[in-house]
């Protein structure tokens, strides 16, 4: 069967028909609809939105749309006992308290159920003590404090600015340093772009705005009480003491008005260098404690949030494939938001909705994709990627045998400057080819391709004339599919100019001010960037589901493997004495990469030449392509991170958002000079080189001729 037997539309026309059906005005309408009230995970409002999406996807023409529910651990503030931070005097009197809520934006003053700013999964507690300012609370910040400045955080409350790394890593680092509480705040240096007004007059963060977010260190586990298995009706749940990834010290977020009040009194050591100074009019002294006149004052945290097992709902829509219904291409993004979700996630959910509508329109005209497309509206992403992970755990046997690709669809925009893509190397050529066929929405690039504007604005650091494509890290719903199951994955969105805007993320991220109006007034009034992202995401799904030969190029994996091997070798060679002493050799890894390169090249030649009309041979070649990503999975996982199983990529151990290449070797080498037993440490480096070399060689062999 050819992929066109189920339709009277030619393949080229299919893609054109699909893309032409996508409309900016619809995305705008859907975004408005999804952002009028909060849709916090575990709430009735978010359940109602799940049912609405289920109903609309059915109307759009999908074959089936089901709700998949799970009972997972979530976290909420206590409605009658609010969280806050105080400065207390020597008598214990509270002489300053942080705000209990964000001032609501215009037009939303009467909206109920706006969850106040909190750090999800913080334990309860009322610690009091001296403050230590720890910059971004990165690994290197604590090294600077402890090793260079000899400042001890043990028994202190630390205050850290948001940005640079995932907030859960900040909390983990503070715990390891012995802190008894963490205050997170948004510094204007990171969340207030110069020359732009605060919301509602611009897209900057006002002083009362606060970033919510979870502070877990799940390392891919999903629901903290049911790691590895779905949180279904008959689940066995761990006790809270054995739960995965929960923080052990109280944590709370504040805005920069409140942060000013805490930081202006700081004494102790001066900041070590200018990289520790933000933009507030405070000295950015590290502490510990307050300066002279205020030295008897302390900081006290009041945290009363509770962890509760709560029902969540994914929406799973199916468009059955005409030729290979047992091959799944998945488009998924989350639905739950911290408050209104103007950008995160509803700018993504609105795009998914329009993509479903377009596919549904084609299906109603008699068309079907070659392969099955699954659409997902995930719940509880903000609480640790819970909905996607539980569903993947429940369906892991199907996914590992049938999963072709996963395309993520969270926020469509984090700026309006250029495209940003993170994906498996297998998808590089797909992304390049697709963006060459799409029109750029950028001013000054009228009549030019998206590829051209993207390449001009975000050039590859290695290859001239090509755009930058980044490694997948984590912090979003592709994690379980890529890092645990080894399903080829990708994500695309419009982003800011990273060179001129050094703030972290976008200023209003996870605040009450992330509204429909923020997008419609300031980011994308014409919704042209949303439309472009819909075309990229939808186009990728279309090609993955419909092309006769899967649009994966294994030669691009060979190129990056060589680059990553070069990089990790260079890191290791910074310890030449130990390399020599312990006979640490990268020969096996370079040899495996060489073999992979040669075998991938031969496979690509066979892919050009084979008889595509022979369905058995076609399926065989496609299976080799589909299973290549799977071949990089080590069933034993990474050390102490069993759900991160991809040997080539993992979220950085120091920043969940960032991807690290050859993570096993990288982590074994990290700070190796401080290890108490160098022989054991370098033995682990050698073991990790062995695991990586074996995995690359084994993956190469999956591309060899089968007999």
């Amino acid at each position: 069967k050819s992929s066109n037997e189920a339709t009277n539309i030619t393949p080229k026309h299919n893609m054109k028909a699909f893309l032409d059906e996508l409309k900016a005005e619809n995305i705008k309408k859907f975004l408005y609809n999804f952002t009028q009230i909060p849709h916090l995970a575990g709430t009735e409002q978010n359940f109602q939105l799940a049912k609405q999406i289920q109903s609309q996807w059915k109307e759009f023409g999908l074959d089936s749309v089901e709700l998949a529910h799970y009972d997972v651990l979530l976290s909420y503030p206590n409605k009658t006992h609010p969280n806050y931070i105080s400065i207390i005097n020597e008598d214990g009197n509270e002489i300053f308290n942080t705000s209990l809520f964000e001032p609501p934006p215009p037009g939303y003053e009467n909206v109920s159920d706006i969850v106040p700013p909190f750090s999800a999964f913080s334990p309860q507690g009322m610690p009091e003590g001296d403050l230590v300012y720890v910059n971004y609370a990165r690994t290197e910040d604590f090294f600077k404090l402890e090793r260079d400045m000899k400042i001890n955080c043990s028994g202190k409350i630390v205050i850290a600015r948001y940005g640079k790394v995932f907030r859960g890593n900040k909390v983990k680092n503070a715990q390891l340093a012995g802190a008894k509480g963490v205050i997170l705040y948004s510094d204007p240096a990171d969340y207030f772009a110069p020359g732009v007004k605060s919301y509602p007059d611009g897209w900057n963060l006002p002083g009362g705005g606060v970033q919510r977010g979870n502070i877990l260190n799940l390392n891919g586990a999903g629901d903290p009480l049911t790691p590895g298995y779905p949180a279904n009706e008959y689940a066995y749940r761990r006790g809270i003491a054995e739960a995965v990834g929960l923080p052990s010290i109280p944590v709370h977020p504040i805005g920069y008005y409140d942060a000013q009040k805490l930081l202006e009194k700081m004494g102790g050591s001066a900041p070590p260098d200018s990289s520790w100074r933000g933009s507030l009019k405070v000295p950015y002294n590290v502490g510990p404690g307050f300066t002279g006149n205020f030295s008897t004052q302390k900081v006290k945290m009041h945290i009363h949030s509770t962890n509760e097992v709560t029902r969540i709902y994914n929406v799973i829509g199916t468009l059955r494939g005409a030729v290979e219904p047992d091959r799944y291409v998945i488009l998924g993004g989350h639905r739950d938001s911290w408050v209104f979700g103007g950008i995160d996630p509803q700018s993504g959910a609105a795009v998914v909705h329009e993509i479903v509508r377009s596919f549904g329109t084609l299906k109603k005209e008699g068309w079907r994709p070659r392969r099955t497309i699954l659409f997902a509206s995930w719940d509880a992403e903000e609480f640790g990627l819970l909905g996607s992970t539980e569903w993947a755990e429940e369906n892991s046997r199907l996914l590992q045998e049938r999963g072709v690709a996963y395309i993520n669809a969270d926020s469509s925009i984090e700026g309006n400057y250029t495209l940003r893509v993170d994906c498996t190397p297998l998808m590089y050529s797909l992304v390049h080819n697709l963006t060459k066929e799409l029109k750029s929405p950028d001013e000054g690039f009228e009549g030019k391709s998206l590829y051209e504007s993207w390449t001009k604005k975000s050039p590859s650091p290695e290859f001239s004339g090509m755009p930058r494509i980044s490694k997948l890290g984590s912090g979003n719903d592709f994690e379980v599919f890529f890092q645990r199951l080894g399903i080829a994955s990708g994500r695309a969105r419009y982003t800011k100019n990273w060179e001129t805007n050094k703030f972290s993320g976008y200023p209003l991220y996870h605040s009450v001010y992330e509204t429909y109006e923020l997008v419609e007034k300031f980011y994308d009034p014409m919704f042209k960037y949303h439309l472009t992202v819909a075309q990229v995401r939808g186009g990728m799904v279309f090609e993955l589901a419909n092309s006769i030969v899967l649009p994966f190029d294994c030669r691009d994996y060979a190129v990056v493997l060589r680059k990553y091997a070069d990089k990790i070798y260079s890191i290791s060679m910074k310890h030449p004495q130990e390399m020599k002493t312990y006979s640490v050799s990268f020969d096996s890894l370079f040899s495996a990469v060489k073999n992979f390169t040669e075998i991938a090249s031969k496979f690509s030649e066979r892919l050009q030449d084979f008889d595509k009309s022979n369905p058995i041979v076609l399926r065989m070649m496609n299976d080799q392509l589909m299973f290549l990503e799977r071949a990089f999975i080590d069933p034993l996982g990474l050390p102490d991170r069993p759900f991160y199983r991809h040997v080539i990529y993992a979220p950085s151990s120091h920043n969940k958002y960032a991807g690290e290449s050859f993570p096993g070797i990288y982590d074994a080498l990290f700070d190796i000079e401080s290890k108490v037993d160098p022989s054991k440490a370098w033995g682990e480096v050698k073991r990790q080189i062995y695991v990586a070399a074996f995995t690359v060689q084994a993956a190469a062999e999956t591309l060899s001729e089968v007999a």
Epitope: A565, D566, K567, M579, D587, K594
Partner: nanobody
Framework: EVQLLESGGGLVQPGGSLRLSCAAS????????LSWVRQAPGKGLEWVSS????????DYADTVKGRFTISRDNSKNTLYLQMNSLRVEDTAVYYC??????WGQGTLVTVSS
Amino acid sequence: EVQLLESGGGLVQPGGSLRLSCAASGFSFSSYALSWVRQAPGKGLEWVSSIGENNHTTDYADTVKGRFTISRDNSKNTLYLQMNSLRVEDTAVYYCVKDGVHWGQGTLVTVSS
């Protein structure tokens, strides 16, 4: 059998330049990243620079950044280290290294007035 043969060392005045070469044989040269490592008299080994498969992928120790340039010619199976603005503290035996375990015999660079 892997062989790495360094050359180009010698005596040079501070501020002067030298170009070291490392001729390689016995392995698929272009398939390996390579490094320069040095050992100053009475000191331990110190990494200087590494290079990947092409001249884009390079890395340098802070002590030599901006003064030294590593490069390779895959057609000639040769690794190079161009050393400019040499300092007294650059005096050392310079080794070419493949994969971490295969080392050349080294070439002596002496920077002295």
